[in-house]
C-alpha cells in the first residue's frame, strides 16, 4: 500500500573539524521510494556538486572535506507524490584548531615608544591568545597588554622588553605556535662618563675618558676645538654595550676637547656630546723648577748641536721630560721660522743648550744655565733682527702658543761666566773671537746692550748646522 | 682602536730578499716614533731597528746594518723594513711597534702581533 | 758590545712580592739608559709596563714598579697575582756606542 513519508532518524547537529568528513542521516521509511533532496541554509545543494557525497538514495549527504565556510543548517526533503513532503533539519558545527592568521614579526624600536606585535587567530571554538617571552609566560602588566584582537602591545618600550617573542593560540580542539620573532629595543646614545677638564703643565700627558651607551653601541669621535683631534692615540674598550673611549694628549696648548657618541636608528642618528678644557698652567713653571735627572740626550732635533755623551738635565715637572722638552726645541724652530744662515745655527745651539741644559750629577741633579756671555751673542749679534721681531709678536700676542717663552731664555736672568766659570755653560758652537765678527754685516742700529767679551777662540770659525732641522 | 698589522713575512732562501709592512691606524703616524723588534723562535725579544716621527733619521742593530732598511710613509701611515742579504739567523717573528713619542728610542707602547720571517734553504 | 742580563727564571706566591733585576755585563745602569720594562705572556705580543726607570704606562696596575737598586734596573711587583705569570724583559738605551736599543734575555717568572 502506499505510504506516505515518514522521516525515522531526524537529523542532529553535527561537529566536525576542517578538512575532515561530516556526514548527515536522513532515514526515510515511505512506500513507493522518495525523492529526497538536501539544502543547505535554504540553498539546494545540487547532485553533482563534487563536494558532496549523496549515497542510500539520499538518505546519506557527506561532506568530503569540511571547510570552515560550511557552518549553518543543513535539512532533508522526503517527497513520493503520497501525503506532503516531510523535512527534517540539523546544525553543521565547524569545529576548528587554532590557526595564526597574521604572526608577529620582528621589531626594532627605540626605548620609550610603543610596540604591537601582531597575533591574529581563527579556530572555533574561539582560541584564547598569550604570549611567551623566551621560555617564560609573559605577564600583563600596566605597559603591557594581550589585545582582544591577540596583538601584544607594549607601552613605554624599556630595554628589558628587548628579547625573543611567540604567541600562543589555544582552544579545545588543541594549540597553534607562532615562530620566533625578535623585538629589539633601540636606546638613543647617552653620555656615561663625560671628559674632566684637566689644569696641567706644558708638557704633561692627559687622559681624557668618555663612556657612552645605547643600542646599537655607538662610535665615539674626539673633536679638538671644533676640528677632528690631530694628535694623541686613542684606545677604544666595549663591554656590555658601553663603549670606552680613551684619548692620550701630550699638552702643548690649551684646548677644547669634545667626545661625540653617535648610534644609527635606521636612517636617522642620534648623538650626545661632552666637553672638557685642558688649560695649561703657569707656562714657565718647568724652567723654576729644578727637580729632575740627568742622562744622555736620545732624541733627534738637538742630536748635531748637543756634545756627544752629554747628559743633559731632564725635568721631571714634565710627565715624560724627554719628549716635552723635545717637542719644545722643535716647536720652538716652528715658531721662529725664517731666519738667516747666519742666526740659524746660533739659535739652535742656544734653544738646545737651553731647553736640554748641561746636567752636573750629584746627590742633586743640577742644570746648568748657559752664560749670559752666549746668549747675548745669539741675542745682539747673530739674531739680532730675527730676535726683535721675535719680541714684538710677544708684545703683539701674535704666537699661537705661549712655548716659546720657555724656549727663548732671558739673557740678563742668567750668570756670567766671569762670576764662576764652572756655574753656567759655554755654547760649543759658537766658538769664535772677537776678530770673526768683523766679517759679519751689521744687524742692529742700536749699540749692543752690554759689551760682548772675548768668548773662548776655536780653531774653526765655521757653524755646525743640523743637516736634518733648520730653521727655515 | 689602535692597531698595527704587519705584513709581507713569509719563507725565503739565504741571500734573498723580502719587504715587510706595518700598516698602523687609530693613532696620529706621524706624531710617533716606530721600531722593529724580532723574536727568534723560543728566543727572547731583540731590537732591529728605529725610526723617529718625521723619518730623519735611521738606526740599526750592528748585525743588519747594511743589509735592512726601515722607512716609513707617514702620509700612508706605513712602516717599512727592507731585508736584504737574508741569513738563516735572521728567522723570527717580526713586530712593529710604536714609540710612546717622536723620538726613535724609548718604551714601545703598542705592538703589531708580528708577521713570520723563515729563512731556509 | 755590553750584554743586559736578567735572573733567567723567578718564582713568587700569590700576594707576594718579587724584585726583577736588569745589569749590564760591563758596569752600572745608569739613568742614561732609560731602562723600560717589558710582559710577555706565552702567544701573545709584548706590553710595555715601565719606561725610563720608573713611569708606569697607562693602564699598569700600580703592583708594579721601576727604580735602580745598586748598579741595576729594578722591576718590583709587589702583591703578585696569578696572571703576572710571564716572561718579562728590560730594554736599555745604549747610546755610547752607536745609539742602540737592547733588550735583556728575559726573566720567566712563575707564579706558584
Known amino acids: 500500500l502506499p505510504k506516505a513519508p515518514v522521516i525515522t532518524t531526524p537529523l542532529e547537529t553535527v561537529d566536525a573539524l576542517v578538512e575532515e568528513v561530516a556526514t548527515f542521516m536522513c532515514a526515510v521509511e515511505s512506500y513507493p521510494q522518495p525523492e529526497i533532496s538536501w539544502t543547505r541554509n535554504k540553498i539546494l545543494i545540487k547532485l553533482f556538486d563534487t563536494r558532496y557525497s549523496i549515497r542510500e538514495n539520499g538518505q546519506l549527504l557527506t561532506i568530503l572535506s569540511v571547510e570552515d565556510s560550511d557552518d549553518g543548517i543543513y535539512c532533508c526533503t522526503a517527497n513520493n507524490g503520497v501525503g506532503g513532503a516531510v523535512e527534517s533539519c540539523g546544525a553543521l558545527q565547524v569545529k576548528m584548531k587554532p590557526k595564526i592568521t597574521r604572526p608577529p614579526i620582528n621589531v626594532k624600536i627605540i626605548e620609550g615608544l610603543k610596540a604591537v606585535l601582531p597575533c591574529t587567530t581563527m579556530g572555533n571554538p574561539k582560541p584564547s591568545v598569550s604570549w611567551i617571552k623566551g621560555d617564560s609566560p609573559l605577564r600583563e602588566n600596566s605597559r603591557i597588554a594581550v589585545l582582544e584582537s591577540g596583538s601584544l602591545r607594549i607601552h613605554n618600550v624599556q630595554k628589558e622588553d628587548a628579547g625573543q617573542y611567540r604567541c600562543v593560540a589555544k582552544n579545545s580542539l588543541g594549540t597553534a605556535y607562532s615562530k620566533v620573532v625578535k623585538l629589539e629595543v633601540e636606546v638613543f646614545a647617552r653620555i656615561l662618563r663625560a671628559p674632566e677638564s684637566h689644569n696641567v703643565t706644558f708638557g704633561s700627558f692627559v687622559t681624557l675618558h668618555c663612556t657612552a651607551t645605547g643600542i646599537p653601541v655607538p662610535t665615539i669621535t674626539w673633536i679638538e676645538n671644533g676640528n677632528a683631534v690631530s694628535s694623541g692615540s686613542i684606545q677604544e674598550s666595549v663591554k656590555d654595550r658601553v663603549i670606552d673611549s680613551r684619548l692620550q694628549l701630550f699638552i702643548t696648548k690649551p684646548g677644547l676637547y669634545t667626545c661625540i657618541a653617535t648610534n644609527k636608528h635606521g636612517e636617522k642618528f642620534s648623538t650626545a656630546k661632552a666637553a672638557a678644557t685642558i688649560s695649561i698652567a703657569e707656562w714657565s713653571k718647568p724652567q723654576k723648577d729644578n727637580k729632575g735627572y740627568c742622562a744622555q740626550y736620545r732624541g733627534e732635533v738637538c742630536n748635531a748641536v748637543l756634545a756627544k755623551d752629554a747628559l743633559v738635565f731632564l725635568n721631571t715637572s714634565y710627565a715624560d721630560p724627554e719628549e716635552a722638552q723635545e717637542l719644545l726645541v722643535h716647536t720652538a724652530w716652528n715658531e721662529l721660522k725664517v731666519v738667516s744662515p747666519v742666526c740659524r745655527p746660533a739659535a739652535e745651539a742656544l734653544l738646545c743648550n737651553h731647553i736640554f741644559q748641561e746636567c752636573s750629577p750629584g746627590v742633586v741633579p743640577t742644570p746648568i744655565p748657559i752664560c749670559r756671555e752666549y746668549c747675548l751673542a745669539v741675542k745682539e749679534l747673530f739674531c739680532a733682527k730675527e730676535w726683535l721681531v721675535m719680541e714684538e709678536k710677544t708684545h703683539r700676542g701674535l704666537y699661537r702658543s705661549e712655548m716659546h717663552l720657555l724656549s727663548v731664555p732671558e739673557c740678563s736672568k742668567l750668570p756670567s761666566m766671569h762670576w764662576d766659570p764652572t756655574a753656567c755653560a759655554r755654547l760649543p758652537h759658537l766658538d769664535y773671537n772677537k776678530e770673526n765678527l768683523k766679517t759679519f754685516p751689521p744687524m742692529t742700529s742700536s749699540k749692543p746692550s752690554v759689551d760682548i767679551p772675548n768668548l773662548p777662540s776655536s780653531s774653526s770659525s765655521s757653524f755646525s748646522v743640523s743637516p736634518t732641522y733648520s730653521m727655515t | 682602536e689602535l692597531q698595527l698589522v704587519e705584513s709581507g713575512g713569509g719563507l725565503v732562501q739565504p741571500g734573498g730578499s723580502l719587504r715587510l709592512s706595518c700598516a698602523a691606524s687609530g693613532f696620529t703616524f706621524d706624531d710617533y716614533g716606530m721600531s722593529w723588534v724580532r723574536q727568534a723562535p723560543g728566543k727572547g725579544l731583540e731590537w732591529v731597528s728605529a725610526?723617529?716621527?718625521?723619518?730623519?733619521?735611521?738606526y740599526y742593530k750592528e748585525s743588519v746594518k747594511g743589509r735592512f732598511t726601515i722607512s716609513r710613509d707617514n702620509a700612508k701611515k706605513t712602516l717599512y723594513l727592507q731585508m736584504n742579504s737574508l741569513k738563516s739567523e735572521d728567522t723570527a717573528v717580526y713586530y712593529c711597534?710604536?714609540?710612546?713619542?717622536?723620538?726613535?728610542?724609548?718604551?714601545?707602547?703598542?705592538w703589531g702581533q708580528g708577521t713570520l720571517v723563515t729563512v731556509s734553504s | 758590545q755590553a750584554v743586559v742580563t736578567q735572573e733567567p727564571s723567578l718564582s713568587v706566591s700569590p700576594g707576594g712580592t718579587v724584585t726583577l733585576t736588569c745589569g749590564l755585563s760591563?758596569?752600572?745602569?745608569?739613568?742614561?739608559?732609560?731602562p723600560d720594562w717589558y710582559q710577555q705572556t706565552p702567544g701573545q705580543a709584548p706590553r710595555a709596563l715601565i719606561y725610563s726607570t720608573n713611569s708606569r704606562l697607562s693602564g699598569v696596575p700600580s703592583r708594579f714598579s721601576g727604580s735602580f737598586s745598586g748598579n741595576k734596573a729594578a722591576l718590583t711587583i709587589t702583591g703578585a697575582q696569578p696572571e703576572d705569570e710571564a716572561d718579562y724583559y728590560c730594554a736599555l738605551y745604549m747610546g755610547s756606542e752607536s745609539r742602540n736599543y737592547v733588550f735583556g734575555g728575559g726573566t720567566k717568572l712563575t707564579v706558584l
Open positions: 711597534a710604536k714609540r710612546s713619542g717622536r723620538i726613535a728610542f724609548g718604551a714601545l707602547d703598542a
Open positions: 760591563s758596569g752600572s745602569v745608569t739613568s742614561s739608559n732609560y
Open positions: 725610526i723617529p716621527w718625521n723619518g730623519g733619521s735611521t
